[in-house]
């Protein structure tokens, strides 16, 4: 009987117990982006640091070629922040020239690529018009939410304009996921 | 044999199991800031409410003197939102005066102090240029991510200008962390 | 004795162990809002998709009539993003007309309704002045934090102006919660 003292009862456990420290987890940080070919109408994907400084991957969560690889099915919390910076947006120049005032924008998308679906799935999008008065502007877009993922799924972060991403500091632009 | 029925198998458990309700957790909320001495080139740290209203600390996660004290090594999700508010930024005044248009900015940094590294580590930064047309402006900066912390580490939230922080409501400006 | 090999010790476990996959969780996504009556000085609540596309509820976390229903007491991480979009805010029109320059604003509130308290409790608020130069603007407000909730509590997302919410894509505007 003693052996059962702290063994969870049948009512409490509907799935295998597992130690929290054993769950797939990753926090990736920004690196300088090398220009890569990307297709028309498709936002380019960022690549990331996965082991230096604050960055890590653990418990079979691997990073390869812009993708976080999901090693185990389950519910994951996924997050990213991208800090953008630029010179005065064209918006104000267009406005001064008296042309239609269409604002510029900055967009971050966290995308899932899965075997079971032919198209990538946009999980999260943060998009913001940029129509700044100042000559230099900078601002972050933060995203985070929970999704049910399958083993073998791949996650990436796409941005509207890779040249506007602030890659100078690991605390400004990052991407992470962890199994709940 | 019966005693083993729900004991996790060797394959499933690589670290001690622990009850989720027993994990260190804190959610701190804003209080009116008393001016404190801070040193040159160092953003001032906010202090926080830790037990009234929505605020709490539990399971050995303690708050003292601007710091959340990490009681146990592991992976933590850390988050903060700071709502800033101000009058028209100097940016537009500078612009009107015809001087170079350098935008003002607002910045939040979540900082770790650890005894295993000689200087504070910036974990997360949200920084935004402020160049508002309106006479009064207000806006939040939100941050959140996962980090591996050590027992004894200290976390704080630093801001670029403590006088711009909206301390009026506990739901506008807050800081929290929990062991995953 | 063998039966105890991986059973957690008394020191490690202070509450019943439970499988992570069995915890209440939900991720809700935006739908087109039908105009509903809301009381003066009270922000309207959004309603949500709870089962199509990326949306789901599981493990007794239910969605009904704009509310997430909390099935079990504990600490929950709650999050939402609302993307707003609009035409030029009145702010700039007021300014051109020489009247006092009061900025417009956009606000998101995550609210808890509980049996044990007569008033709804605002858990999280993101509020931002909008005083855009461009003719069309769009931007997200993101919120997320941890709260101690009671069985039977209800969560909703309120916004300052339902007509400004971008309901076009499930990745732009969403609401979720999960038991830690």
């Amino acid at each position: 009987l003693k052996g059962q003292e702290f063994a969870p009862s049948h009512q409490q456990v509907y799935a295998p117990l597992r130690a929290d420290g054993d769950k797939p987890r990753a926090h990736l940080t920004v690196v300088r982006q090398t220009p890569t070919q990307h297709f028309k109408n498709q936002f380019p994907a960022l690549h990331w640091e996965h082991e230096l400084g604050l960055a890590f991957t653990k418990n079979r969560m691997n990073y390869t070629n812009k993708f976080l690889l999901i090693p185990e099915s389950g519910d994951y919390f996924i997050y990213s922040q991208v800090t953008f910076r630029g010179m005065t947006s064209e918006c104000s120049e267009i406005r001064q020239a008296g042309r239609p005032n269409k604002p510029d924008s900055i967009t971050v998308v966290i995308t899932k690529v899965t075997d079971s679906y032919p198209e990538p799935t946009q999980l999260l999008m943060g998009t913001k018009s940029v129509c700044e008065v100042g000559s230099n502007w900078f601002q972050p877009i933060y995203l985070g939410a929970m999704f049910s993922l399958q083993e073998g799924d791949k996650l990436m972060v796409n941005v509207s304009d890779i040249s506007l991403v602030d890659y100078t500091k690991e605390d400004k632009t990052f991407f992470g996921a962890f199994l709940l | 044999l019966k005693g083993q029925e729900f004991a996790p198998s060797h394959q499933q458990v690589y670290a001690p199991l622990r009850a989720d309700g027993d994990k260190p957790r804190a959610h701190l909320t804003v209080v009116r800031q008393t001016p404190t001495q801070h040193f040159k080139n160092q953003f001032p740290a906010l202090h926080w409410e830790h037990e009234l209203g929505l605020a709490f600390t539990k399971n050995r996660m303690n708050y003292t003197n601007k710091f959340l004290l990490i009681p146990e090594s592991g992976d933590y999700f850390i988050y903060s939102q700071v709502t800033f508010r101000g009058m028209t930024s100097e940016c537009s005044e500078i612009r009107q005066a015809g001087r170079p248009n350098k935008p003002d900015s607002i910045t939040v940094v979540i900082t770790k102090v650890t005894d295993s590294y000689p200087e504070p580590t910036q974990l997360l930064m949200g920084t935004k240029s402020v160049c508002e047309v309106g006479s009064n402006w207000f806006q939040p900066i939100y941050l959140g991510a996962m980090f591996s912390l050590q027992e004894g580490d200290k976390l704080m939230v630093n801001v670029s200008d403590i006088s711009l922080v909206d301390y009026t409501k506990e739901d506008k400006t807050f800081f929290g962390a929990f062991l995953l | 004795l063998k039966g105890q090999e991986f059973a957690p010790s008394h020191q490690q476990v202070y509450a019943p162990l439970r499988a992570d996959g069995d915890k209440p969780r939900a991720h809700l996504t935006v739908v087109r809002q039908t105009p509903t009556q809301h009381f003066k000085n009270q922000f309207p609540a959004l309603h949500w998709e709870h089962e199509l596309g990326l949306a789901f509820t599981k493990n007794r976390m239910n969605y009904t009539n704009k509310f997430l229903l909390i099935p079990e007491s504990g600490d929950y991480f709650i999050y939402s993003q609302v993307t707003f979009r609009g035409m030029t805010s009145e702010c700039s029109e007021i300014r051109q007309a020489g009247r006092p320059n009061k900025p417009d604003s956009i606000t998101v509130v995550i609210t808890k309704v509980t049996d044990s308290y007569p008033e709804p409790t605002q858990l999280l608020m993101g509020t931002k002045s909008v005083c855009e130069v461009g003719s069309n603007w769009f931007q997200p407000i993101y919120l997320g934090a941890m709260f101690s909730l009671q069985e039977g509590d209800k969560l909703m997302v309120n916004v300052s102006d339902i007509s400004l919410v971008d309901y076009t894509k499930e990745d732009k505007t969403f609401f979720g919660a999960f038991l830690l």
Epitope: - | Q37, F39, A45, N62, T64, N65, K66, F67, L69, V113, T114, D115, S116, Y117, P118, E119, P120, G152, K154 | -
Partner: antibody, heavy 116, light 106 residues
Framework: QVQLVQSGAEVKKPGASVKVSCKAS????????MHWVRQAPGQGLEWMGR????????KYDPKFQVRVTMTTDTSTSTVYMELSSLRSEDTAVYYC?????????WGQGTTVTVSS | EIVLTQSPGTLSLSPGERATLSCRAS?????MYWYQQKPGQAPRPWIY???NLASGVPDRFSGSGSGTDYTLTISRLEPEDFAVYYC?????????FGGGTKLEIK
């Protein structure tokens, strides 16, 4: 400027205790960690332990665990190291230092002589 | 505890020469720290987190290494560089120092 000023030299008899102080200026000690290191004559450096002045939390080298006590008085920005049951081999220069904030600063040292 | 072994114990060189001081850990550490000490003075922080020079340290000094093997290098010795150098690890408790390398004028 940032500095640590330690108390003066001490001469103690075997079996007695000594309490060395270290007063900080130019920074808030609660923002850092304070360490104690000793150096016996002609020998190398030996880490004794550290205190987190914000929480009072200490970590000691097991070698000193039963004899050393580190404390803080935040109102005066001072940390203390008390070593009990002194023996002749405790004769050394005792240094306080800080970590968690650059520059990594050391006190000038306090000479403790244990002699009968 | 993690034992740090410094070699050589004493290094005799002339000004203008290159000096290489070694510190080996008994198990892997994240970073190494180096201190300079002159007779009658407190140790001075010299290199932190393996390769970062403390304020005021000339750039003829450099630090490198990872895992268990770390090195302090002085590209061209100046008279004021002759002193004792200690390595220290902060990765495991207790913190430990190496026994020191005495850099003396030949």
């Amino acid at each position: 400027q940032v500095q640590l000023v330690q108390s003066g030299a001490e001469v103690k008899k075997p079996g007695a205790s000594v309490k060395v102080s270290c007063k900080a200026s130019g920074f808030d000690i609660q923002d850092t960690y304070m360490h104690w290191v000793r150096q016996a004559p002609g020998q190398g450096l030996e880490w004794m332990g550290r205190i987190d002045p914000a929480s009072g939390h200490t970590k000691y080298d097991p070698k000193f665990q039963v004899r050393v006590t580190m404390t803080t008085d935040t109102s005066t920005s001072t940390v203390y190291m008390e070593l009990s049951s002194l023996r002749s081999e405790d004769t050394a220069v005792y240094y306080c230092s800080r970590s968690g904030g650059l520059p990594d600063v050391w006190g000038q040292g306090t000479t403790v002589t244990v002699s009968s | 505890e993690i034992v740090l072994t410094q070699s050589p114990g004493t290094l005799s060189l002339s000004p203008g020469e290159r000096a290489t001081l070694s510190c080996r850990a008994s198990s892997s550490v994240s970073y190494m720290y180096w201190y300079q000490q002159k007779p009658g003075q407190a140790p001075r922080p010299w290199i932190y987190a393996t390769s970062n020079l403390a304020s005021g340290v000339p750039d003829r000094f450099s630090g490198s290494g990872s895992g268990t093997d770390y090195t302090l290098t002085i590209s061209r010795l100046e008279p004021e560089d002759f002193a004792v150098y200690y390595c220290q690890q902060w990765s495991g408790n207790p913190r430990t120092f190496g026994g020191g390398t005495k850099l003396e004028i030949k």
